[in-house]
Amino acid sequence: FSPLRRISIKILVHSLFSMLIMCTILTNCIFMTMNNPPDWTKNVEYTFTGIYTFESLVKILARGFCVGEFTFLRDPWNWLDFVVIVFAYLTEFVNLGNVSALRTFRVLRALKTISVIPGLKTIVGALIQSVKKLSDVMILTVFCLSVFALIGLQLFMGNLKHKCFRNSLENNETLESIMNTLESEEDFRKYFYYLEGSKDALLCGFSTDSGQCPEGYTCVKIGRNPDYGYTSFDTFSWAFLALFRLMTQDYWENLYQQTLRAAGKTYMIFFVVVIFLGSFYLINLILAVVAMAYEEQNQ
């Protein structure tokens, strides 16, 4: 070993070196949170880049760059360090037009903390392992969601467009003439029934157990879907999103109430099955796989 390499190894294995890097990363993170940093922080930025460059040089000199088995670039954690340094020099010395987009990559410096803290390294390692192991569960989840999305598509397509429409029109007005002239929210409220505080017209249905319209209103299928058109089963993709919402239980009770009001109470069976299978079973299966991967990583 050359004297330079020996010195690099000594520095690399020294605990103070890890401490220095750790403190540098944390200080850098603090500086990154500044809203309007003063001019002198530019020099501090250069200092950080210098320390990171020094750290990488020490690692390269001690371990070699990329040829051997345990060299610098053979460790995925060092790829992060390498990218951080490359982007630091790129944003500083190369004029690449939209620099603010490249500045985003400075946030990667915060991720360097992971490679320094051993506990964090274990957790992230487990996370990466779990993602690999999750592929089968993900395929199963997507398959189940797709099947139920197709069922939802068949059962509820267009149902969430059912609205309570005012019966007492002017003599020359028709549903079509009104829909062609409606522009503002105010216009809509004039012809459709809205519950107090609601941003969408009252939903209704044509089956006996679905929601009925109040006196003076009749159920029609017209206009857009609720929630600015985002809640529907009209296409496979929207149905898939709705099912994903059910699986993650993201304000699912609203979707449940909307659909049951438009389609009928009988369809609660569909929601019971989806919540039990998607939300309780599949979510817990995913958690189990993550827990197993973490356990393996710990051992």
Partner: nanobody, 124 residues
Framework: EVQLVESGGGLVQAGGSLRLSCDAS????????MRWHRQGAGKQREFVAR???????DYADSVKGRFTISRDNAKNTVYLQMNNLNPEDTAVYYC??????????????????WGRGTLVTVSS
């Protein structure tokens, strides 16, 4: 496809009575309002009477007290009972309805449908 068919028109003496009916057919889920309109020779089409699905009624001033609109929801039919007819009532009477029906491929559509009309002639 939804169809509205008017019937009951014909020739009647002034002061006489007629009962028009309008039958809606097709895969109908709900009929909202149903209206009668009329169009005399060389005149604009004018509103005559309306009935909503909860049986609220409304009439044009010219026919108030003489005409009565009613409906049979089970049969998807609307009736117009015309009493004390006079020559000014001579026109083609059209039926209009706001219908929600199951159309091609089982999808649901709401729209305004019109009949082809039935001629009522009142002679003096």
């Amino acid at each position: 496809e939804v169809q509205l068919v008017e019937s009951g028109g014909g020739l009647v003496q002034a002061g006489g009575s007629l009962r028009l009916s309008c039958d809606a057919s097709g895969r109908i889920l709900r009929i909202g309002y149903m209206r009668w309109h009329r169009q005399g020779a060389g005149k604009q089409r004018e509103f005559v009477a309306r009935i909503t699905d909860d049986s609220a009624t409304d009439y044009a001033d010219s026919v108030k007290g003489r005409f009565t609109i009613s409906r049979d929801n089970a049969k998807n039919t609307v009736y117009l009972q015309m009493n004390n007819l006079n020559p000014e009532d001579t026109a083609v009477y059209y039926c209009e309805a706001l219908v929600t029906a199951s159309v091609r491929g089982g999808s649901i559509h709401s729209g305004t449908y019109w009949g082809r009309g039935t001629l009522v002639t009142v002679s003096s």
